[in-house]
């Protein structure tokens, strides 16, 4: 089966690479605009230049194109802890990231939030913090992992998942309680 192509892809596939089919005359292939520019006017005829203009401040195109408008530059989202790694240029969007000792958590494909890397107090670093992943901690005996922090087994309630990890401690606590009642 041939995959369904959108109108624009269909039109482009008729022309060689780096060119697109004239929207009013499908016998003409116009040269695409370079990155950092956008299409102001289609080429008037075969072998004639496409009228491309440079993107204005605050906008960009990152690849060759025949867009009628440049794309708006992204803004780093301060409320998500994001910082600007590199500013927008005519041919590259803003690059946002996190501060040192932080990692990105993606809530969706195009939204991330910065969080502090876990320090693994009362545990050891199993895997170091990376750009898109928090530190992986292994907890010392008598501690269990909750929300990526090593928490004392004295905070483990029987209904929680920690019971398996903390079972000896729970039994001990129960034992001392029982012995105190005699």
């Amino acid at each position: 089966l041939v995959p369904h192509l959108g109108d624009r892809e269909k039109r482009d596939s008729v022309c060689p690479q780096g060119k697109y089919i004239h929207p009013q005359n499908n016998s003409i292939c116009c040269t695409k605009c370079h990155k950092g520019t956008y299409l102001y006017n289609d080429c008037p005829g075969p072998g004639q230049d496409t009228d491309c203009r440079e993107c204005e401040s605050g906008s960009f195109t990152a690849s060759e194109n025949h867009l009628r408008h440049c794309l708006s530059c992204s803004k780093c989202r301060k409320e998500m802890g994001q910082v600007e790694i590199s500013s927008c240029t005519v041919d590259r969007d803003t690059v946002c990231g996190c501060r040192k000792n932080q990692y990105r958590h993606y809530w969706s494909e195009n939204l991330f939030q910065c969080f502090n890397c876990s320090l693994c107090l009362n545990g050891t670093v199993h895997l170091s913090c990376q750009e898109k992943q928090n530190t992986v901690c292994t907890c010392h005996a008598g501690f269990f992992l909750r929300e990526n922090e090593c928490v004392s087994c004295s905070n483990c309630k029987k209904s929680l998942e920690c019971t398996k990890l903390c079972l000896p401690q729970i039994e001990n606590v129960k034992g001392t309680e029982d012995s105190g009642t005699t």
């Epitope: 803004k75 989202r77 301060k78 409320e79 998500m80 958590h105 809530w107 939030q113 969080f115 928090n134 929300e147 990526n148």
Partner: nanobody, 119 residues
């Protein structure tokens, strides 16, 4: 004690509109970024929209962009979600939440309000 109480859900036909509200208490609402998330039947949580404390430059998931509008009234400690041109795929329980601070989980979020869109 933080409390978030959603309302405004219901049954609506495809193409229709609903306005969800979230009444907040127990914290300084005007200082917090607020979030709408949703959970469709049998699916995981999806981030719908969020709005910073000053109400400027809200974020929308691609799936709702141009159809949903988030807003807030800091004097009433209330968050809103205006939902227009509703689709069957918008059917979900909608929760309002405080933007997480310590890690990628929701410490504070409401019980939710069910939105059902019939096609």
């Amino acid at each position: 004690e933080v409390q978030l109480l959603e309302s405004g859900g219901g049954l609506v036909q495809a193409g229709g509109s609903l306005r969800l509200s979230c009444a907040a208490s127990g914290f300084t609402f005007a200082h917090e970024t607020m979030v709408w998330v949703r959970q469709a039947p049998g699916k995981g949580l999806e981030w719908v929209s969020h709005i910073p404390p000053d109400g400027q430059d809200p974020f929308y998931a691609d799936s709702v962009k141009g159809r949903f509008t988030i807003s807030r009234d800091n004097s009433k400690n209330t968050l809103y979600l205006q939902m227009n041109s509703l689709r069957a795929e918008d059917t979900a329980v909608y929760h309002c939440a405080l933007l997480p601070k310590r890690g990628p989980w929701f410490d504070y979020w409401g019980q939710g309000t069910l939105v059902t869109v019939s096609s």
